[in-house]
Interface confidence: low
């Protein structure tokens, strides 16, 4: 049902032990009660007890306190639970009768049998609150107080408000007075089921499935879920989208795996040479004198070019070579000669002519021999 | 005639378990609350606990909550007392009785005993 | 919760005296008070209900009085068989508790 009308009785006083008809019982009034809950009417008239009924045991003799028993068992306050919306008023009839057996049933008692009866109208609003009363007449007097809850899950000034509190699947919240959810702590929506990321949370990027976590949205990471990631295999470059690779400067290809600036990143070019880059991962080094190799590793030596003439031997330095010439000539790579044919220079049977440039003279080599003078035999 | 008659006592370890039963015959069980009072050996009653057998609803003492349970069995006329986690001074004898609506104990069992010991 | 609190713990008496039982409550019962009858090896009987109201079957040598904190039982001339214990029982509120017993014994 959606609430509860309770009726707790509290003391009911019949000292002289008589029924309504003033006729004593033998050997007291063993009592209890039938209570009738109605509709409003203007005058209470018998009819059907349109919003309940409920009997009692016999709860004493004559005169007597009922116990309370407010752990909610049913007994004291007594319970008579409607599924409808409480109209705000009501009707009730409390007879007291005796039970000269133990046979409570209204067919098994005489008609005489009744101790008294009352009957009340009037307004009742929904709340927690006891009202307290007391109906007296010349023979007896009963206390009881009354009030309408709502039962569990219902709510609002006429209990017409279902709300049940959950935290599952379906939503995370406890019920308001009024019958309005709210929310569970990290969780919110109009039923309390979308989970309240972590803060800071990227709101594009980033999820949750519960309260104060952040998951990812594919192509993006990072504990809030802000930082995108590159294309796989990116090497040497970044991105501002997922799966992009913008190479870093001096980088190239499509995972920026390319180095377009060999000669800073790796200055291959030894012994002073200058580095020119020629595209990716070429270079070429421009060697100064004296050294020689893709990578002016080598160092040159000048006497392998053979510079020396005229039988001139040669001789490495630090600032490149020297020729030692035989006697009878001179120059930096032994040119010159201070000999004629009158000297007979020519060997192993070459013939002498004489000349004006540079030379002196020139030797005319017979086969087999050669050198300026015919002095090397020819394998 | 009204009749409560208890069984299922004897002798349990501590933190052991235990269920007496209370078959009610005489009166209408559903009509009726019943209540588990005890006697520890040369003491006086403590109440248990009660049940309403038509709704199922109980009370307890704070000495037993939590880890004893009331039950009804509105077929068998008879209530239940489970009895876990025991202790040694929840050793004594268990009566049923029925408990009238003022909160009174017109009938009783002739009990049970139960002791818990190692 | 409500304690009850009997006296005398014991006492002695002969066949044919009046026996008084008093039961203090800790708070006010009204008259949600029971008093039982208990022999050795036997359980408790009901004598009085709602203070002062004699259980059907119980032998009119025993009444009981009183309301608000303070309950008598009262035996007018003790026979054999009413060596016993006897203990008070409030029904009032919360749960039930009984006083700690009053043991009537032979003089």
């Known amino acids: 049902g959606s609430g509860v009308f309770q009726l707790q009785l509290q003391e009911f006083i019949n000292e002289r032990g008589v029924l309504a008809s003033g006729r004593p019982c033998e050997p007291g009034c063993r009592t209890f009660f039938r209570v009738c809950l109605k509709h409003f009417q203007a005058v209470v008239s018998p009819g059907p007890c349109t919003f309940g009924t409920v009997s009692t045991p016999v709860l004493g003799t004559n005169s007597f306190a009922v116990r309370d028993d407010s752990s909610g068992g049913g007994r004291n306050p007594l319970q008579l639970p409607f599924n409808f919306t409480w109209p705000g008023t009501f009707s009730l009839i409390i007879e007291a009768w005796h039970a000269p057996g133990d046979d409570l049933r209204p067919e098994a008692l005489p008609p005489d049998a009744l101790i008294s009866k009352i009957a009340i109208q009037g307004s009742l609003a929904v709340g927690q609150n006891w009202l307290l009363d007391e109906q007296t007449s010349t023979l007896t007097r009963l206390r009881y107080s009354y009030r309408v809850i709502c039962s569990d899950n219902y709510y609002g000034d006429n209990c017409s408000r279902l709300c049940k509190k959950r935290n599952d699947h379906f939503g995370h919240y406890v019920c308001q007075p009024d019958g309005n959810l709210s929310c569970l702590p990290g969780w919110t929506g109009e039923y309390c089921q979308q989970p309240i990321c972590l803060s800071g949370c990227h709101e594009q990027n980033g999820y949750c499935s519960k309260p104060a976590e952040c998951l990812c949205r594919p192509g993006w990471q990072g504990r809030l879920c802000n930082e995108c990631i590159p294309h796989n295999g990116c090497r040497h470059g970044t991105c501002s989208t997922p799966w992009q690779c913008t190479c870093d400067e001096g980088w190239g290809g499509l995972f920026c795996d390319q180095d377009l600036n060999y000669c800073t990143h790796h200055s291959p070019c030894k012994n002073g040479a200058t580095c020119s880059n020629s595209g990716q991962r070429s270079y070429t080094c421009t060697c100064r004198p004296g050294y020689t190799g893709v990578d002016c590793e080598l160092e040159l030596s000048e006497c392998d070019s053979n510079p020396c003439r005229n039988g001139g031997s040669c001789k490495d330095q630090e600032d490149g070579y020297h020729c030692l010439c035989p006697p009878g000539y001179y120059g930096l790579h032994c040119e010159h000669s201070t000999l004629s044919c009158a000297d007979s220079p020519c060997f192993n049977g070459g013939s002498c002519r004489e000349r004006n440039q540079g030379a002196n003279y020139a030797c005319e080599c017979p086969p087999n021999f050669t050198g300026s003078n015919c002095e090397k035999k020819v394998d | 005639e009204v009749q409560l008659v208890e069984s299922g006592g004897g002798l349990v370890q501590p933190g052991g378990s235990l269920r007496l039963s209370c078959a009610a015959s005489g009166f209408t069980f559903t009509d009726n609350w019943i209540s588990w009072v005890r006697q520890a050996p040369g003491k006086g009653l403590e109440w248990v606990g009660v049940?309403?057998?038509?709704?199922?609803?109980?009370e307890y003492a704070d000495s037993v909550k939590g880890r004893f349970t009331i039950s009804a069995d509105t077929s068998k006329n008879t209530a239940y007392l489970q009895m876990n986690s025991l202790r040694a001074e929840d050793t004594a004898v268990y009566y049923c009785a029925r408990d009238n609506f003022g909160g009174y104990f017109d009938y009783w069992g002739q009990g049970t005993l139960v002791t818990v010991s190692s | 919760d409500i304690q009850m609190t009997q006296s005398p713990s014991s006492l002695s008496a002969s066949v044919g005296d009046r026996v008084t039982i008093t039961c203090r409550a800790s708070?006010?019962?009204?008259?949600?008070v029971a008093w039982y009858q208990q022999k050795p090896g036997k359980a408790p009987k009901l004598l009085i209900y709602s203070a002062s109201f004699l259980y059907s079957g119980v032998p009119s040598r025993f009444s009981g009085s009183g309301s608000g904190t303070d309950f008598t039982l009262t035996i007018s001339s003790l026979q054999p068989e009413d060596f016993a214990t006897y203990y008070c029982?409030?029904?009032?509120?919360?749960?039930?508790?009984f006083g700690q017993g009053t043991k009537v014994e032979i003089k």
């Open positions: 708070q006010d019962v009204s008259t949600a």
């Open positions: 049940i309403n057998p038509n709704s199922g609803a109980t």
């Open positions: 029982q409030q029904s009032y509120n919360g749960p039930s508790t």
